[in-house]
């Protein structure tokens, strides 16, 4: 069919509550593209109609909920103009009762439900909740061991529980919660969350590495299209935000109206040690007014930025 | 060129019944979800009836929830509506439209008249 | 259910006028409001989707904005195909709703 295939992802995750996966795959997925979601090979799309139980809402596949015979291997074709390129995601749904301890251990999770606290620090752990803009997420509960989270040591900050001074009783089982309402309609999320205690400060220190940008200035034509990538390393069991800003604001706030220049999706790489992070920083259209401003790359307390410049003038025209 | 083409309207007595067809072309049918729309005379538009592309899932509006029924037949690329004990309020314009996940396309409608 | 309020129901411009119409969701619908144009006698036609996003074929004078409840369609400048009833309905919600529809007369 002409399709190239990127990669397989896969998800393992918990029946009878809500699940979304975005197709997103920079710069692929960055310009003009047309996004389709099948399900097992077949030849027909996943609806789009709102009320079905599985559809697709924009660029996302969405589960509300999942249940246990929605396992299988589901493709997305992202079509350009002259491209097609095909991500098959492969989802496992199992059965788990968190508070039931007779149901032995989880499969093998993904990183987001196995989260590390560091002895004697300030950490955090973060609630991993990735779903379209059609759904409302309302506040999130926290709880250790089935019992609701309490206590001067513990904040929760949007997705984020804040642990303060991190003993080895922290470790165990946790769990965080929302309610997230779709068309009306009211859903359970709730992640389980292994935590474990660790001394060491891991790879590279607990500050993130920006590879790239390097506070430099780039050279665009006025009135152009620019994709610019912000390259982050991070302990693979990091809590850190990755954005962009201007004038200390996200890009997707400042310019909240035009939507001109906008925030992408963020993508990692899992490494032995570590992992690599990538959020891309779009400019539809370069303006007079984007020169000489720096916009921000902020991945925990780093920061590096990029300037836009007016290329020279090349006399050789004249 | 997506195109949509109802017929099957026509006047009919109340508790009768009356089949609507679309016929698509254009794109690949199979690859949409579609849906029916209904406009009374002087009125506002009202979503009536949706169905996914393989067919296998249909939604309803409150009121015709029972009476109606959508359906399609992907190897004629044509959406139907059957409708059963008609009304005098279900006297409407019936559209068929593309969905995608707006009402992308439209037909140019055909009109049910219920009435004694 | 969920209820689209247009505002108002129907206006009288001028060919050059700057138009507005509003439609207010009675709750928070967080995602997007599709809009379309329906001439007498004609199927409608959709005009915008996605709050901001036009079809192929419809003019830039035609924009649309706002969240959360408040949507806005916005003619630049009317000209004098744009006389029609407009409507709003929001994307991503069940089961789908249209607003009552605003008719835009020439004064």
């Known amino acids: 069919d002409g399709c190239k295939d990127i990669f397989m992802k896969n998800e393992i995750l918990s029946a009878s509550q809500p699940f979304a996966f975005n197709c997103t795959f920079p710069p692929i997925t960055s310009g003009e593209v047309s996004v389709t979601w099948y399900k097992n090979s077949s030849k027909i799309p996943v609806s789009k109609i709102i009320q079905s139980r599985i559809h697709q809402d924009e660029t996302w596949i969405l589960f509300l909920p999942m249940e246990w015979g929605d396992s299988g291997v589901y493709q997305c074709v992202i079509k350009g103009r002259d491209s097609c390129h095909r991500i098959h995601v492969n989802l496992t749904v199992f059965e788990k009762h968190w508070c039931d301890t007779s149901i032995g251990g989880l499969p093998n999770l993904s990183d987001e439900y196995k989260q590390i606290l560091h002895l004697g620090k300030d950490d955090s752990l973060t609630c991993h909740l990735h779903f379209p803009k059609s759904c409302v997420l309302g506040p999130i509960k926290w709880y250790k061991d089935c019992n609701e989270i309490k206590g001067e040591r513990f904040t929760v900050l949007e997705t984020r529980l804040l642990v303060s001074n991190v003993s080895a009783e922290d470790r165990g089982n946790y769990a965080c919660q929302a309610i997230l309402t779709h068309s009306g309609k009211q859903y359970e999320v709730l992640n389980g969350i292994t935590v474990s205690i660790t001394e060491r400060a891991g790879y590279g220190g607990s500050v993130p590495k920006i590879i790239y940008p390097k506070n430099h200035s780039i050279e665009v034509q006025l009135g152009t299209t620019l994709i610019v990538d912000c390259n982050v390393t991070d302990t693979k069991d990091n809590t850190n935000l990755r954005c962009w800003r201007v004038n200390n604001t996200l890009v997707d706030d400042y310019y909240d109206e035009s939507k001109r220049i906008r925030e992408g999706v963020e993508t990692h790489v899992s490494f032995r040690e570590h992992n690599l992070y990538t959020v891309n920083i779009t400019f539809l259209e370069v303006k007079m007014e984007d020169y000489g401003l720096p916009f921000m790359c902020h991945a925990g307390v780093s920061t590096a930025y990029i300037i836009l410049q007016l290329p020279a003038p090349d006399f050789r025209a004249y | 060129e997506v195109q949509l083409l109802e017929s099957g309207g026509g006047l009919v007595q109340p508790g009768g019944s009356l089949r609507l067809s679309c016929a698509a072309s254009?794109?690949?049918?199979?690859?949409?979800?579609m849906s029916w729309v209904r406009q009374a005379p002087g009125k506002g538009l009202e979503w009536v009836s949706a169905?996914?592309?393989?067919?296998?899932?249909?939604y309803y509006a409150d009121s015709v929830k029972g009476r109606f029924t959508i359906s399609r037949d992907n190897s004629k690329n044509t959406l139907y509506l059957q409708m059963n004990s008609l009304r005098a309020e279900d006297t409407a314009v019936y559209y068929c439209?593309?969905?995608?996940?707006?009402?992308?396309?439209w037909g140019q409608g055909t009109l049910v008249t219920v009435s004694s | 259910d969920i209820q689209m309020t247009q505002s108002p129901s129907s206006l009288s411009a001028s060919v050059g006028d700057r138009v507005t119409i509003t439609c207010r969701a009675s709750?928070?619908?967080?995602?997007?409001v599709n809009w379309y144009q329906q001439k007498p006698g004609k199927a409608p036609k959709l005009l915008i989707y996605?709050?901001?996003k036009r079809p192929s074929g419809v003019p830039s004078r035609f924009s649309g904005s706002g969240s959360g409840t408040d949507f806005t369609l916005t003619i630049s400048s009317l000209q004098p195909e744009d006389f029609a009833t407009y409507y709003c309905?929001?994307?991503?919600?069940?089961?789908?709703?249209f607003g009552q529809g605003t008719k835009v007369e020439i004064k």
């Open positions: 709750q928070s619908i967080s995602s997007y």
């Open positions: 169905i996914e592309g393989a067919g296998s899932d249909t």
């Open positions: 439209a593309r969905l995608a996940p707006e009402f992308d396309y």
């Open positions: 996605q709050n901001d």
């Open positions: 254009g794109f690949t049918f199979s690859d949409y979800d």
């Open positions: 309905q929001p994307s991503f919600y069940f089961p789908y709703a």
